[in-house]
């Protein structure tokens, strides 16, 4: 069993979806879990999130907010073997850019 | 602070459909995974219902397999188990929780009474 | 899915040791180490003792220990008090987003 790599950062806007790949090799079942290195207190052991979505162990984050920032780890077991984990990838949330001033529509311009 | 608060529990028929919710608020909801244990009076703690994270996966005790439905609203920071085909046997106080590792949340429970 | 083993009953005095046990199958306990101990007084929801097999969480009692061996976890409380009396449970991750529970254990604090 071994991983492939995975993006070292993911941005996304604010309000968004994150999703976060957990490539691997196995062929069969493998048991995928996700952890959480909190941002900012790297000190911490990782937090358990849960099982990845799907037979490729996705992991989806909806509705991201300041507080999910942090390294997302993926870790793949199969049957008893030991777990291989994943380098981790940044999540980084994005504030979407304020509105300009003058993206407004013509009937207002016109006032 | 972690909050979670069960809410939905009471009273009902054998035959008869309830549905739990839980409210979470104080941490961020959308990244877990998140479950209901029960535990029936004088018992110990059973595992019934997952589900992942974004809703994508949902798991069962072989006990109420085909009977309970979990279901989640992350717009609203809110976990669900709709639990059809009541049995005296599910009579329990039924946890909301976010288990393993550190960040462990429980709810205080809802008492759930299956009796004619 | 069946229960964990725990014994169904155990005592001592104050200030003695106890150890109780929690046997599964490997298919239980898998790799992973996501093995925890919960206290819990009557009429009160579970509290978390002890996290991946051996951690504490801050906040609880270093009398307090835990340890996994093959396809044994083991809780260990020191210097027994009068307020750890209670039922202890183990639980451990089984895959997905599933998890197994010991039976429970009474602990009883002889006066």
């Known amino acids: 069993l071994w991983m492939h790599k995975v993006p070292a950062s993911l941005m996304v806007s604010l309000g968004e979806d994150a999703h976060f790949q957990c490539p691997h090799n196995s062929s069969n079942n493998a048991n995928v879990t996700w952890w959480r290195v909190l941002h900012g207190n790297y000190t911490w052991p990782p937090e358990f999130l849960g099982p990845g979505e799907d037979p490729n162990g996705t992991l989806i984050i909806q509705n991201v907010n300041k507080s999910h920032g942090g390294i997302y780890v993926c870790r793949v077991q199969e049957g008893n073997e030991s777990y291989q984990q994943s380098c981790g990838t940044y999540l980084r949330v994005r504030q979407p850019p304020p509105r300009p001033f003058l993206d407004m529509g013509e009937g207002t311009k016109n006032r | 602070e972690v909050q979670l608060l069960e809410s939905g529990g009471g009273l009902v028929q054998p035959g008869g459909s309830l549905r739990l919710s839980c409210a979470a608020s104080g941490l961020t909801f959308t990244s877990y995974a998140m479950n209901w244990v029960r535990q029936a009076p004088g018992k110990g703690l059973e595992w019934v219902s997952g589900i992942s994270g974004s809703g994508g996966g949902t798991y069962y005790a072989d006990s109420v397999k085909g009977r309970f439905t979990i279901s989640r609203d992350n717009s609203k920071n809110t976990l669900y188990l709709q639990m059809n085909s009541l049995r005296a046997e599910d009579t329990a106080v039924y946890y909301c929780a976010k288990l393993g590792g550190w960040s462990d949340y429980w709810g205080q429970g809802t008492l759930v009474t299956v009796s004619s | 899915q069946s229960a964990l083993t725990q014994p169904a009953s155990v005592s001592g005095s104050p200030g003695q040791s106890i150890t109780i046990s929690c046997t599964g199958t490997s298919s239980d306990f898998g790799s992973y180490n996501l093995v925890s101990w919960y206290q819990q007084h009557p009429g009160k929801a579970p509290k978390l003792m002890i996290y991946e097999g051996s951690k504490r969480p801050s906040g609880v009692s270093n009398r307090f220990s835990g340890s996994k061996s093959g396809n044994t976890a083991s809780l260990t409380i020191s210097g027994l008090q009068a307020e750890d009396e209670a039922d202890y449970y183990c639980?451990?991750?089984?895959?997905?987003?599933?998890?197994?529970f010991g039976g429970g254990t009474k602990l009883t604090v002889l006066t």
């Open positions: 639980c451990s991750y089984a895959g997905g987003s599933t998890w197994v």
